[in-house]
């Protein structure tokens, strides 16, 4: 069998949601010695980056100006070292927001409950779309789905103080255009004084996965490296939207 | 901002040569990428060539490989394109285009990735 270097990561560093006409930047995490990185979209070459020196830093950043409808979609990369090429990297998808109008979030019984009582959120948007999507901040990547014509209802069952947070809402023209994001709904869960204390609370941080990893050489690194990289892509899960 | 002029196209026999121009305005030349892109009649704009900011990388596609070479003098602010051993199917628009990216190394390939473009120049190999 034809010989291949591991595959890269990719990521997108802040967020894979970019509004219109910003700038996004997705990282490729490959190997020291990488001496090109290449950008793929939809399956076809978008940009192409050669490190110098190539033995000094272990991925690379790509810049998409302008974000559009039309460079929003599935991103890929690989990386060669000499001769030898990487396996293609997971699927990034890049998502494009902020475009057309704003729907509306509300939740039902209202923004403060409490523990085990049922909440259902509504996405409310008069422009012609099918598809709501709602995201609780901090778990980006965890993103609820729901169909309606100008409203989605996303019940969300007996509740938690896991539940707890901020809720955003968009309505999606596709699966790579958004709307512009709700303003946001905090929902309060309030439980028993043993039940609190024992809930798993949800920390609004950023997404770990939406950072840029990438490290220059120093000393050790050379020779763990490789193994490094292996080990990363085998713990590493993607997860798509 | 940058605005781009592309010059030096022309009619060519088969097997001749010619030397593109894109004059680039502005002071901050030298952080732009660039790139040539061409489009024929009744076909989609391809890929010609690209060039990093400090022209340290260049990138070119299959067909025009070994026949084409892009250069850039920051000096002058401007990209050029010497087009050597055409042929019929060169024949096309010619386009410069202009980017920024996050590196002295990086270049684009796909049209999508550049945010500034010149009007184009036309470019013929016919006998």
């Known amino acids: 069998p034809k010989q291949t270097l591991p595959k890269p990561i990719i990521r997108a560093e802040s967020t894979y949601m970019v509004p219109k006409e910003k700038q996004a930047t997705l990282c490729c995490q490959g190997s020291y010695g990488a001496v090109e990185y290449q950008l793929h979209f939809e399956g076809s070459l978008f940009a192409v980056e050669r490190p110098k020196p190539p033995e000094r830093i272990n991925g690379v950043k790509f810049h998409i100006p302008d974000m559009n409808s039309r460079k929003a979609g599935r991103y890929s990369c690989i990386y060669r070292v000499g001769e030898l090429w990487s396996e293609r990297s997971d699927l990034l998808d890049l998502v494009v927001t902020e475009m057309y109008d704003t729907p509306t979030l509300s939740v039902h019984p209202g923004p403060e409950v409490t523990s085990g009582e049922k909440v259902t959120f509504y996405c409310r948007l008069d422009t012609a779309t099918s598809m709501f999507l709602l995201l609780k901040e901090g778990r980006s990547r965890d993103v609820q789905r729901s169909y309606g014509k100008v409203q989605a209802e996303f019940p969300m069952g007996p509740v938690t103080t896991a539940h707890r947070g901020s809720y955003r809402c968009f309505g999606s023209y596709n699966n790579y255009a958004w709307s512009f994001p709700s303003e946001p709904v905090k929902l309060l869960v309030t439980g028993d004084i043993e039940n609190t204390s024992l809930a798993p609370t949800d920390p609004t941080f950023p997404d770990s996965w939406d950072t840029c990893l990438l490290t220059r050489e120093t000393g050790l690194q050379k020779d763990l490296a490789l193994w490094d990289h292996t080990a990363q892509n085998h713990h590493h899960h993607h997860h798509h939207h | 901002q940058v605005q781009l002029v592309e010059s030096g196209g022309g009619l060519v026999q088969p097997g001749g040569s010619l030397r593109l121009a894109c004059a680039a305005s502005?002071?901050?030349?030298?952080?732009?990428?660039m790139g040539w892109f061409r489009q024929a009649p009744g076909k989609e704009r391809e890929f010609v060539a690209a060039?990093?900011?400090?022209?340290?990388?260049?990138y070119y596609a299959d067909s025009v490989k070994g026949r084409f070479t892009i250069s850039r003098d920051n000096a002058k602010n401007t990209v050029y394109l010497q087009m050597n051993s055409l042929k019929p199917e060169d024949t096309a628009v010619y386009y410069c285009a202009a980017s920024r990216p996050l590196s002295n190394t990086q270049v684009g390939v796909a049209s999508a990735w550049y945010e500034f473009w010149g009007q184009g120049t036309l470019v013929t190999v016919s006998s």
């Open positions: 060039i990093s900011r400090n022209g340290g990388t260049t």
């Open positions: 502005g002071r901050t030349f030298s952080t732009y990428a």
